[in-house]
């Protein structure tokens, strides 16, 4: 049921597409051989207890992830695409979304953004997501209406709380994350701030409170004094490595 789903994420996920949509059934699992390593932006990720998030496009992944077929020979994956960790600067890339926030893909390499690489008035195909229609959606109708629209994006960088489609729409130090009704520019997390350790276990919940990633030199770890809380409600915070 809707009221028992996981709805916060550090991985900045979009809601699953409606049943039968491009992304398949919500929560559909992808079979990946345990122990396979994927090259991430900051580390190699082992998939021993990591269930990949299936995707059809970059927008279905987190701001620090991109959508791609695993390239490292994971058995059983077939042609399915999953969300992979973004690539740090100086790593190889094929498109902007592969690079971690604050970087873009230039000549096949992730480079630091100076925001000048976006032509002013560039026309982009953008995914606009609305939770519900012009009036409150009926209970249980929590999937976004996904409509593709050609919009003129002038790349004046969004300030904290302003609407966005992706992190590149936001000013430095901010990422684009879902905040209940909409996606807005939120601050990258500082030490001690609550983060979300995204486990990807079982079916994927409707994640409508998304958080940015922890800032440089920080990792999302369980808060030491919260061990008494139940597993489901334990807080994670950004802590020094």
């Amino acid at each position: 049921t809707l009221n028992s789903v996981l709805i916060n994420s550090n991985a900045i996920k979009n809601l699953p597409p409606p049943l039968g949509g491009a992304g398949g059934q919500p929560g559909s699992a992808v079979s990946v051989a345990p122990g396979v390593l994927y090259e991430g932006g900051n580390k190699y990720q082992t998939l021993d207890n990591y269930q990949p998030y299936p995707c059809a496009e970059d927008e279905e992944c987190g701001s620090d992830e991109y959508c791609s077929s695993p390239s490292r020979g994971a058995a059983g994956v077939g042609g399915v695409q999953i969300c992979l960790a973004c690539r740090k600067r100086r790593k190889r890339c094929m498109r902007h979304a592969m690079c971690c926030p604050g970087n873009y893909c230039k000549n096949g390499i992730c480079m630091p953004s100076d925001h000048s690489h976006f032509p002013r008035g560039e026309i982009e195909e953008s995914i606009i997501e609305n939770l519900g229609n012009d009036h409150n959606a009926a209970a249980g109708d929590g999937y976004p209406r996904r409509t593709t629209l050609t919009s003129k994006i002038y790349h004046t960088k969004g300030q904290e709380g302003s609407v966005c489609l992706r992190s590149s729409d936001c000013a430095a130090g901010l990422c684009c994350a879902r905040h209940f009704w909409s996606k807005i520019c939120k601050p990258v997390l500082k030490e001690g701030q609550v983060c979300t350790k995204h486990k990807r276990k079982g079916s994927h919940g409707l994640e409508i409170f998304q958080r940015c990633y922890c800032g440089e030199g920080l990792a999302c770890r369980i808060q030491k004094d919260h061990h008494q809380a139940s597993n489901s409600s334990r807080l994670h915070t950004c802590q020094r490595h």
Partner: antibody, heavy 116, light 112 residues
Framework: QVQLVESGGGLVQPGGSLRLSCAAS????????MSWVRQAPGKGLEWVSV????????YYADSVKGRFTISRDNSKNTLYLQMNSLRAEDTAVYYC?????????WGQGTLVTVSS | DIALTQPASVSGSPGQSITISCTGT?????????VSWYQQHPGKAPKLMIY???NRPSGVSNRFSGSKSGNTASLTISGLQAEDEADYYC???????????FGGGTKLTVLG
Amino acid sequence: QVQLVESGGGLVQPGGSLRLSCAASGFTFSSYWMSWVRQAPGKGLEWVSVISSDSSSTYYADSVKGRFTISRDNSKNTLYLQMNSLRAEDTAVYYCARHGIDFDHWGQGTLVTVSS
Amino acid sequence: DIALTQPASVSGSPGQSITISCTGTSSDLGGYNYVSWYQQHPGKAPKLMIYDVNNRPSGVSNRFSGSKSGNTASLTISGLQAEDEADYYCQTYDQIKLSAVFGGGTKLTVLG
């Protein structure tokens, strides 16, 4: 700095209508969702409605659904709340609030009194 | 419906620390770790003090802090000052009704 100024409140009879306005300045109005929140005299805060930055989505509290309509004019930096079929229990101070990361900026409110 | 329960009133002396609680259920506060806090002085508009459990907007004193354990969120004010006397509201969202929800409010009295 961010400023939100409500107007349009007043005394109205039960069953009557009123239209509230909220003039916004000091930020890019068209980039933010906006809300109305009300507070009955001596009571707590009650969320009323929200509208997306481009007016494509609106949501309402059950207590006002079908009677109130939220709208906005981005060219005028103005938020509106059309209130129809007003009831005594709608008597409250109505606040216009910017919904950035939660309700991060509020106006000073306008009082709506529904009484015969 | 989601209901957030707050104590009607709390009090403390200047310099002390006080904590205001906000209790939900496992399907709201306990399930998704999201709550904000607002301060409202009499006759004034509310002001956002804490968002996303423990984040302070710029301009808010670091005497204000938020935390959460299980189904209960808490606002702690340390080094209590006379100007902290106000009503405090917690707030979260109802994912079924797609609405915002406020707690009933807590009146903070600073003694002496």
